[in-house]
């Protein structure tokens, strides 16, 4: 190797200056005694290199790029060799930003997968490889005192969520949770959440069903629907409130909300609807009165209201 580049920093803030030095060894005898060292950033030649001969006979060129405005580029030093440019050495330069503070960190406890799933917004693009780590610890109190640390949760590349498995969780006990973002230019941390995994539980919705008509029960009135629901069994012991939404299948009507309904109602007569009309219905539930997240809306149930009972009109004929 005849030449070697060293840089003040290979990774800098976007727009910051960068200084580089290229040294050519004396024993490169096939070179001119006073070779002119050229600089190139990407495909563009860069003026402004200051060249000097050092006491040991090596040649050095120093260049300062006032603003590195490329997020990634190769800086090379070269010599004119005949009619072509002979590259002596090159380095990769990167420029970007330190990570912004991750924000909107939120978590939900999934009782089916037995894991606490946390997600966040990473903030603006840094243009640099940036790693995110979900960090947490167990705490007996309100997270002012740190208990056992929990194994870091590292999301897959490009993902802004991570799942803490059950073996690292303690239900009905607070956990401190935060996201740490790190790249070559710095580290940032989100504000810490302090939560009991059960307080962010997201239940599965009940299954809506048509109510089986029983011989002794009166049929639904016109504009009414009789429906029932089957609670999600594993969440049965969690006190919940639920809400229904419905809309006619035809037309552009928006959803109408009915609730709150206690989970234990298990059956319901919905009235005030249009007669002889097909409706789409869904239900969802939330842990209540304790904190929790709304479940997703259940799969739709499609039901039709009964016809209006025929009314007898007396027609008066006027002669």
């Amino acid at each position: 190797e005849c030449g070697h580049i060293s840089v003040s920093a290979p990774i800098v803030h976007l727009g910051d200056p960068i200084t580089a030095s290229c040294i050519i060894k004396q024993n490169c005898s096939h070179l001119d005694p006073e070779p002119q060292i050229l600089w190139r950033l990407g495909a563009e030649l860069q003026p402004g290199g200051r060249q000097q001969r050092l006491s040991d006979g090596t040649q050095e060129s120093i260049i300062t790029l006032p603003h590195l405005n490329h997020t990634q580029a190769f800086l090379s030093c070269a010599l004119n060799w005949g009619n072509s440019l002979q590259i002596l050495d090159q380095v990769e330069l990167r420029a970007g930003y330190p990570p912004a503070i991750p924000h909107n960190l939120s978590c939900l406890m999934n009782l089916t997968t037995s894991s606490l799933i946390c997600q966040w917004e990473p903030g603006p693009e840094t243009h640099l490889p940036t790693s995110f780590t979900l960090k947490s610890f167990k705490s007996r109190g309100n997270c002012q005192t740190q208990g056992d640390s929990i194994l870091d949760c590292v999301p897959k590349d490009g993902q802004s969520h991570c799942s803490i498995p059950r073996k690292h969780l303690l239900l009905y006990q607070n956990m401190g949770i935060w996201v740490q973002a790190e790249n070559a230019l710095g580290t940032s941390m989100s504000p810490q959440l302090c939560l009991d995994p059960m307080d962010v539980v997201k239940l599965e919705p009940p299954m809506l069903r048509t109510m089986d008509p029983s011989p002794e029960a009166a049929p639904p009135q016109a504009g009414c629907l009789q429906l029932s629901w089957e609670p999600w069994q594993p969440g049965l012991h969690i006190n919940q409130k639920c809400e229904l939404r419905h809309k006619p299948q035809r037309g552009e009507a928006s959803w109408a909300l009915v609730g709150p309904l206690p989970l234990e109602a298990l059956q319901y007569e919905l009235c005030g609807l249009l007669p002889a009309t097909a409706y789409t219905l869904q239900i969802r539930c939330i842990r209540w009165p304790l904190p929790g997240h709304w479940s997703d809306w259940s799969p739709s149930l499609e039901l039709r209201t009964t016809e209006r009972a025929p009314t007898h009109h007396h027609h008066h004929h006027h002669h």
């Epitope: 009782l111 089916t112 997968t113 037995s114 059950r166 073996k167 239900l171 059960m198 609670p231 069994q233 594993p234 049965l236 012991h237 969690i238 006190n239 206690p262 234990e264 109602a265 298990l266 009165p289």
Partner: antibody
Framework: EVQLLESGGGLVQPGGSLRLSCAAS????????MGWVRQAPGKGLEWVSS????????PYADSVKGRFTISRDNSKNTLYLQMNSLRAEDTAVYYC???????????WGQGTLVTVSS | DIQMTQSPSSLSASVGDRVTITCRAS??????LNWYQQKPGKAPKLLIY???NLQNGVPSRFSGSGSGTDFTLTISSLQPEDFATYYC?????????FGGGTKVEIK
């Protein structure tokens, strides 16, 4: 401190009836599912029945369905088990229990013995 | 109905031993598996809920693991007060079922 105190056990003839009570204190009774678990002499634990916080959901073990009725009075903080058509195989210590949100039996009473014998 | 099979039905061990009891569900129950300890003439006591969560006041030598169908209760170093009968219970769906019990006796 949570306390569950069962009463109403005793000796009863086959075909007879008995009503067990469980007086609860030390927690907000109306917010929790409650249940009954029994244990025949020298045998393991057997779930009998549970009741939701407001009493609307009442699952039963097949072995007692149609004969036993679980109920609660939230104003009195009391759980009940009405046992009819009793059989010799219903002989057991009956425990009243408070359920946690994930269905575990969190707190237990000391138990009351029901003996069905002629 | 979900059946719970516990093994062994009894075991003999010495103070300081590591003891493992297993419980198998006839179908997947996620993490809805609870463990209880019962001493003669006493009511059962909750040790572990939701497969691995230690109930308040229970010594840390007790631990639970597993999910789906296979679960384990481990006592890392058996103490004199641990000689008792242990039961597992599924709370995933009704009817709730207990395992047959494991009696831990002094060797």
């Amino acid at each position: 401190e949570v306390q569950l105190l069962e009463s109403g056990g005793g000796l009863v003839q086959p075909g007879g009836s008995l009503r067990l009570s469980c007086a609860a204190s030390g927690f907000t009774f109306s917010l929790y599912w409650m249940g009954w678990v029994r244990q025949a002499p020298g045998k393991g634990l057997e779930w009998v029945s549970s009741i939701s916080s407001s009493g609307g959901v009442t699952p039963y073990a097949d072995s007692v369905k149609g004969r036993f009725t679980i109920s609660r009075d939230n104003s009195k903080n009391t759980l009940y088990l009405q046992m009819n058509s009793l059989r010799a195989e219903d002989t057991a210590v009956y425990y009243c229990a408070k359920l946690g949100e994930l269905g575990f039996f969190q707190e237990w009473g000391q138990g009351t013995l029901v003996t069905v014998s002629s | 109905d979900i059946q719970m099979t516990q093994s062994p039905s009894s075991l003999s061990a010495s103070v300081g031993d590591r003891v493992t009891i297993t419980c198998r569900a006839s179908q997947g129950i996620s993490s809805y598996l609870n463990w209880y300890q019962q001493k003669p003439g006493k009511a059962p006591k909750l040790l572990i809920y939701y497969a691995s969560n230690l109930q308040n006041g229970v010594p840390s030598r007790f631990s639970g693991s597993g999910s789906g169908t296979d679960f384990t209760l481990t006592i890392s170093s058996l103490q004199p007060e641990d000689f008792a009968t242990y039961y597992c219970q599924q709370s995933y769906a009704y009817p709730q079922q207990f395992g047959g019990g494991t009696k831990v006796e002094i060797k």
